[in-house]
């Protein structure tokens, strides 16, 4: 007898996208960085 398959056969893995802005000295512009899965 086999196990009843409770998984769907695949899993969806989500990665976090984190946007951040950083002031650069007196320059009021911003550098936008994109961090994907913990790596900039």
């Amino acid at each position: 007898d086999a196990e009843f398959r409770h998984d769907s056969g695949y899993e969806v893995h989500h990665q976090k996208l984190v946007f951040f802005a950083e002031d650069v000295g007196s320059n009021k512009g911003a550098i936008i960085g994109l961090m994907v899965g913990g790596v900039v």
Partner: antibody
């Protein structure tokens, strides 16, 4: 609102083939986390699982009835169909279809009202 | 196949008193995903079954908190803390751990 509704003949003759349809609404048969089973219950007796179909069309059958059963689905019509060959009076029962969301709850959470089938000549 | 055995098969209970139904499986119901897929269903007279408890002890939505489930491995219990008139019916344990899926023979709850 999730519903399942069974339909089919009320009376079949011995040796005939029974075809039952389960029409679902409120969820999709293509949902990878869902499956649908057929279960029957002879009058005054316990529940008996018959067959199951997964979203990927994988099928499982009762060991004792496997040779007589076929389960299939039409995703676009939202229907699950069960056929049972060579019907006998002992197959007289209420036939239910039920939904099982996999993992959670991992159990039959929604049932149809059932359809009573009598096998008699 | 896994055989599910329920006891007692019939139990007359006084309204407001507790009730308990046991279910034993012939093999462990622990799935390889570490869940134990043991559920309890209630079937009132003339109605289809209704899910009460899933994965041993989780109450399904809309189920009164007087219903509780416990157990592990092969031994499981459904408890009703205070029986009400609407609880009359047949209670089934079932397993969705292994194919073929199997039910207990049913335990009838009646009022004294």
């Amino acid at each position: 609102q999730v519903t399942l509704k069974e339909s089919g003949p009320v009376l079949v003759k011995p040796t005939e083939t029974l075809t039952l349809t389960c029409t679902v609404s409120g969820f999709s048969l293509s949902n990878a986390r869902m499956g649908v089973s057929w279960i029957r219950q002879p009058p005054g007796k316990a529940l008996e699982w018959l067959a199951h179909i997964f979203s990927n069309d994988e099928k499982s059958y009762s060991t004792s009835l496997k040779s007589r059963l076929t389960i299939s689905k039409d995703t676009f019509k939202s229907q699950v169909v069960l056929t049972m060959t060579n019907m006998d009076p002992v197959d007289t029962a209420t036939y239910y279809c039920a939904r099982i969301p996999l993992r959670s709850p991992g159990a039959f959470d929604i049932w149809g009202q059932g359809t009573m089938v009598t096998v008699s000549s | 196949e896994i055989v599910m055995t329920q006891t007692p098969l019939s139990s007359p209970v006084t309204l407001g008193q507790p009730a308990s139904i046991s279910c034993r499986s012939s093999q462990s119901l622990v799935h390889s995903d570490r869940n134990t897929y043991l559920s309890w269903l209630q079937q009132r007279p003339g109605q289809p079954p209704r899910l009460l408890i899933y994965k041993i002890s989780n109450r399904f939505s809309g189920v009164p908190d007087r219903f509780s489930g416990s157990g592990a491995g092969t031994d499981f219990t459904l408890k009703i803390s205070r029986v009400e008139a609407e609880d009359v019916g047949v209670y089934y344990c079932m397993q969705t751990t292994q194919l073929p899926l199997t039910f207990g023979q049913g335990a009838r709850l009646e009022i004294k």
